[in-house]
C-alpha cells in the first residue's frame, strides 16, 4: 500500500494507491487506482516485463548458506524458502540456486523457476 501526501486545496491530504494493474496480459502499461475518502483517481503506470522483475520483486526468498563446492560440476548451491510473494504471484515454496565455486569470476546466479503456473 502506497500513501502519498497531496498538498492541494482539496480536503484530501492522504491518497492510498492500489497495485499497478496492466491493461492487458501481465505487464506493460496499466493503471493504478487511488482512494482518498470518497474520491478516487486512476493514474497511468507501468509494470516491467523483464525476468528480473518477475523473479526478484514478485517472489522474495530467505536463503540458507552456500553448500560445499561440487567438484564434478564446479558449482555450489543453496536453497531458498519463500518469504513473501506478491498477492497474485504464483511462487514456488522453495527454490535452489547455483553459482560457480570460484569467487574470482562474477557470474549471474542461475535459478530454478521462482514462479510457475499450476
Amino acid at each position: 500500500k502506497k500513501k502519498e501526501k497531496v498538498k492541494k486545496g482539496s480536503e484530501c491530504s492522504e491518497w492510498t494507491w492500489g497495485p499497478c494493474t496492466p491493461s492487458s496480459k501481465d505487464c506493460g502499461m496499466g493503471f493504478r487506482e487511488g482512494t482518498c475518502g470518497a474520491q478516487t483517481q486512476r493514474v497511468h503506470c507501468k509494470v516491467p516485463c523483464n525476468w528480473k522483475k518477475e523473479f526478484g520483486a514478485d517472489c522474495k526468498y530467505k536463503f540458507e548458506s552456500w553448500g560445499a563446492c561440487d567438484g564434478s560440476t564446479g558449482t555450489k548451491a543453496r536453497q531458498g524458502t519463500l518469504k513473501k510473494a506478491r498477492y497474485n504471484a504464483q511462487c514456488q515454496e522453495t527454490i535452489r540456486v547455483t553459482k560457480p565455486c570460484t569467487s574470482k569470476t562474477k557470474s549471474k546466479t542461475k535459478a530454478k523457476k521462482g514462479k510457475g503456473k499450476d
Epitope: 500500500k1 492500489g18 497495485p19 494493474t21 496492466p22 491493461s23 492487458s24 496480459k25 501481465d26 487506482e33 522474495k60 524458502t81 519463500l82 518469504k83 513473501k84 510473494a85 498477492y87 497474485n88 504471484a89 504464483q90 511462487c91 514456488q92 515454496e93 510457475g116 499450476d118
Partner: antibody
Framework: QVQLVQSGGGLVKPGHSLRLSCAAS????????MNWVRQAPGKGLEWIGM????????ILNQKFKDKATLSVDIAKNSAYLQMNSLRAEDTAVYYC??????????WGQGTLVTVSS | EIVLTQSPATLSLSPGERANLSCRAS??????LHWYQQKPHQAPRLLIK???QSISGIPARFSGSGPGTDFNLTISSVEPEDFAVYYC?????????FGGGTKLEIK
C-alpha cells in the same frame, strides 16, 4: 497444509471493541497473506483487509479504515483483527484465511460477533 | 472499486444436470478471478483460482473460464453435495471484492 483456528468472538455492546485471533499451525504461517473477511447473517462475503506476517504490510479496505486494525505475532503464529466502535451492523461471522496464489487458500472456521445492548 | 455481478441469483437444477454460473466484472480484471463454494454454517471453499486453474482436492466436474470481464463456473454434472451458494472474488485491485452469490438449489 495450514490449519487456522479462530477465537475471540461473542456478544459485545455497541461502542465497545473486540480483538479476534487466528492461530495458524502446519506450513509456514509467515510466508502467506492473511485475509480477513466477514459475513453478516444471511448476506454475502465482505473483505476487510489483509496483512503479510513477514513484514506486517497491511492493505485495508477503505470502508474499514476507522474500524479495523490488523496485526500479527510471528512468535505465536497468530494474526489478529481489532474491531473498534462496534455497531449493530458489525454483527457477522468473521473469517481469517491464509492465501497463496500457488496453492490456494485455507480458511478458519469463523467466529460470530454479535453487537447488541 | 471493482463490482462483480453474479447471475442468476438462484439456479434450480436436478442432480445430473449441467450448471453454468456467471460472474461479470465492472472492468477488465485479467484472470484474477476466483470461485468459492459455501454451505450453511461453513467457511467458503476455493474451487477455482485465476479463472480456470484447478485446486487440489476439488472434483474435476468443476471448471472455470475467463479472462477479461466475463467469467463462468461450470459444473458438468451436478451432484447432490453441490447444492450451495457460489461466490466469485477478484484479486486484481484493492479492495478485493466478492460477487453477490448464486444459490444453486434442488429443482
Amino acid at each position: 497444509q495450514v490449519q487456522l483456528v479462530q477465537s475471540g468472538g461473542g456478544l459485545v455492546k455497541p461502542g465497545h471493541s473486540l480483538r479476534l485471533s487466528c492461530a495458524a499451525s502446519g506450513q509456514s504461517f509467515s510466508s502467506y497473506w492473511m485475509n480477513w473477511v466477514r459475513q453478516a447473517p444471511g448476506k454475502g462475503l465482505e473483505w476487510i483487509g489483509m496483512i503479510h506476517p513477514s513484514d506486517s504490510e497491511t492493505i485495508l479496505n477503505q470502508k474499514f479504515k476507522d474500524k479495523a486494525t490488523l496485526s500479527v505475532d510471528i512468535a505465536k503464529n497468530s494474526a489478529y483483527l481489532q474491531m473498534n466502535s462496534l455497531r449493530a451492523e458489525d454483527t457477522a461471522v468473521y473469517y481469517c484465511s491464509s492465501w497463496s496464489a500457488k496453492r490456494g487458500d485455507f480458511w478458519g472456521q469463523g467466529t460470530l460477533v454479535t453487537v447488541s445492548s | 472499486e471493482i463490482v462483480l455481478t453474479q447471475s442468476p441469483a438462484t439456479l434450480s437444477l436436478s442432480p445430473g444436470e449441467r450448471a453454468n454460473l456467471s460472474c461479470r466484472a465492472s472492468e477488465s480484471i485479467s484472470n484474477n478471478l476466483h470461485w468459492y463454494q459455501q454451505k450453511p454454517h461453513q467457511a467458503p471453499r476455493l474451487l477455482i483460482k485465476y479463472a480456470s486453474q484447478s485446486i487440489s482436492g476439488i472434483p474435476a466436474r468443476f471448471s472455470g473460464s475467463g479472462p477479461g470481464t466475463d467469467f463462468n463456473l461450470t459444473i458438468s454434472s451436478v451432484e447432490p453435495e453441490d447444492f450451495a451458494v457460489y461466490y466469485c472474488q477478484q484479486s486484481n485491485s484493492w479492495p478485493l471484492t466478492f460477487g453477490g452469490g448464486t444459490k444453486l438449489e434442488i429443482k
